[in-house]
């Protein structure tokens, strides 16, 4: 056929966000005389992308010199592509007319898809700390990627996790997508130094996945263990009792000594010993003047850790036989409201 044909050789083109997209279009004839235009979409809702005749299209450049004699190449390049540029582009030939040019022929259309990198994954943990053996949830979010296909994995200390749920939104085609994943992690006492990692793989990342991390130290509370013991006597009328507070995390700790239920001294943990697993130890001591007591004394070490309900351990100091340096210890949780956190 001699009649002009509009040839768009590519049915589809895929471009990375930020790059330029070349949309090819060629005419088979110089006749009829008239301009070409590029549109995104068709029909009543179409959007003008380029008009050879008039207008300002700062992101569009022509691949060849359109004013050149005998030019049949009407390909365009669109710079700085964003996901919002995705769609089907039509190269349309107009016939010169008066007063207006008349549409004459359209190309078959080229579908432009945009490859956009996902944003750096943001991992967030629970709002409140949990104790070992409990399950906490971590979320991972990344946005702005295209195409929709994406892979997300969770790791804890390098070991892949399986208990997680992932959603990619929206469900249908869109200019760009978001991913949201929630992983469930069971805490152990040794997790103070542990880390969870959300790893995202996408075609735009060329095999170099993005990672977001969260430290379990911000999610875990390891409650202390208490041990009250009597130390060897320094003087005949003095008993030295110590309270060993072990393996707690985080650091915040307030300790109160009670003699027969009456507050003797309150102190805040300052010089702590850090263990290899990230937990802390602390020791407090109490000197009891045995001359001041006729009867046995119950000494209680009460610890409030990280704003939680106080736990305590008691020790019965036998005054009548204090020279024997022995007593008995009693453990209980204090059924009183915790003191205000420091």
């Amino acid at each position: 056929e001699d009649e002009l044909q509009v040839i768009q050789p590519e049915k589809s083109v895929s471009v990375a966000a930020g790059e330029s997209a070349t949309l090819r279009c060629a005419m088979t004839s110089l006749i009829p005389v008239g301009p070409i235009m590029w549109f995104r979409g068709a029909g009543a809702g179409r959007e003008l992308i380029y008009n050879q005749k008039e207008g300002h299209f700062p992101r569009v450049t022509t691949v060849s010199e359109l004013t050149k004699r005998n030019n049949l190449d009407f390909s365009i390049s669109i710079s700085n592509i964003t996901p919002a540029d995705a769609g089907t582009y039509y190269c349309v030939k107009f016939r010169k007319g008066s007063p207006d040019d008349v549409e004459f022929k359209s190309g078959a259309g080229t579908e432009l898809s945009v490859r956009a990198k996902p944003s750096a994954p943001v991992v967030s943990g629970p709002a409140v700390r949990a104790t070992p053996e409990h399950t906490v949830s971590f979320t991972c979010e990344s946005h702005g990627f295209s195409p929709r296909d994406i892979t997300l994995k969770w790791f804890k200390n390098g070991n892949e996790l399986s208990d997680f749920q992932t959603n990619v939104d929206p469900a249908g085609d869109s200019v760009s997508y978001s991913i949201h994943s929630t992983a469930r992690v069971v805490l152990t006492r040794g997790d103070v130094h542990s880390q969870v990692i959300c790893e995202i793989a996408h075609i735009t990342l060329q095999g170099d996945p993005l990672r977001g991390t969260a430290n379990l130290s911000e999610a875990i509370r390891v409650p202390p263990t208490l041990e009250v013991t009597q130390q060897p006597m320094r003087a005949e009328n003095q008993a030295n009792v110590t309270c060993q507070v072990s393996n707690f995390y985080p650091r915040g700790l307030q300790l109160t000594w009670l003699e027969n239920g009456n507050v003797s001294r309150t102190e805040t943990a300052s010089t702590l010993i850090e263990n290899k697993d990230g937990t802390y130890n602390w020791m407090s001591w109490l000197l009891v003047n045995t001359c001041a007591h006729r009867d046995d004394v119950v000494l209680t070490c009460q610890v409030e850790h990280d704003g939680q309900q106080a736990v305590s351990k008691s020790y019965a100091l036998e005054i009548s036989a204090h020279q024997k340096e022995h007593g008995s210890d009693i453990t209980h949780e204090a059924a009183l409201a915790p003191t205000a956190p420091l």
Epitope: A42, G43, T88, E103, K105, S106, A171
Partner: antibody, heavy 123, light 106 residues
């Protein structure tokens, strides 16, 4: 492959309501707009309107405003046409038809059609 | 916009060249599609943008025209082409179809 499968024929009395379904498969349902087209026996085709399957927003042609409603069940990849207060003039075959353009463009031509649902309104 | 297909019926013979016309009541550019519909079946897209053959459509089907006058040509009529043919404009809302042209054997 891409398919639009419509519900079976309906026999209704004047004044009743009918709801026709169009189940889509073979593509991402919320990608492409869905139009509805009416064809009375022995007559031509009339575009009734369309529903944007991504936003759920529907547009009715002026001749089909009032008694006609388009809806979606996205999880079931299904579009619906509901006609209230049926009259004899509603006797026709109703087609669902899918648009060629993704990304929310307005409807243009229709490369994919359902097999049609015949609605007969008779006292 | 009214799409007028003035020929309600057209008689033809196998291997004949057939031209079906469609006239728009106002300028629709090239925003025209053509469909084929066989008895008891749903319409099938043949042409879009006035002259672009849809995927899988035999090349004996050709569309032409712009503005207000459009033509669908079947260059080598086959028995399987006996059907109703509808034009449709998508230049403005509401989308409108022609009343159809029925092809029959002489």
């Amino acid at each position: 492959q891409i398919q639009l499968v419509q519900s079976g024929p309906e026999l209704k009395k004047p004044g009743e309501t009918v709801k026709i379904s169009c189940r889509a498969s073979g593509y991402t349902f919320t990608t492409y707009g869905m139009s509805w087209v009416k064809q009375a026996p022995g007559k031509g085709l009339r575009w009734m309107g369309w529903i944007n399957t991504y936003s759920g927003v529907s547009t009715c042609a002026d001749d089909f405003k009032g008694r006609f409603a388009f809806s979606l069940e996205t999880s079931a990849t299904t579009a619906y046409l509901q006609i209230h207060n049926l009259t004899n003039e509603d006797t026709a075959t109703y087609f669902c038809a899918r648009d060629p353009h993704s990304y929310g463009n307005s409807p243009a031509w229709f490369p994919y059609w359902g097999q049609g649902t015949l609605v007969t309104v008779s006292a | 916009i009214v799409m007028t297909q003035s020929q309600k019926f057209m008689s033809t013979t196998i291997r004949d060249r057939v031209s079906i016309t469609c006239k728009a009541s106002q300028n629709v550019g090239i925003s025209v599609a053509w469909y084929q519909q066989k008895s008891g079946q749903s319409p099938k897209l043949l042409i879009y943008s006035a002259s672009n053959r849809y995927t899988g459509v035999p090349d004996r089907f050709t569309g032409s025209g712009s503005g207000t006058d459009f033509t669908l040509t079947i260059s080598n009529m086959q028995s399987e082409d006996l059907a109703d043919y509808f034009c449709q404009q998508y230049s403005s809302y509401p989308l409108t179809f022609g009343s159809g042209t029925k092809l029959a054997i002489k």
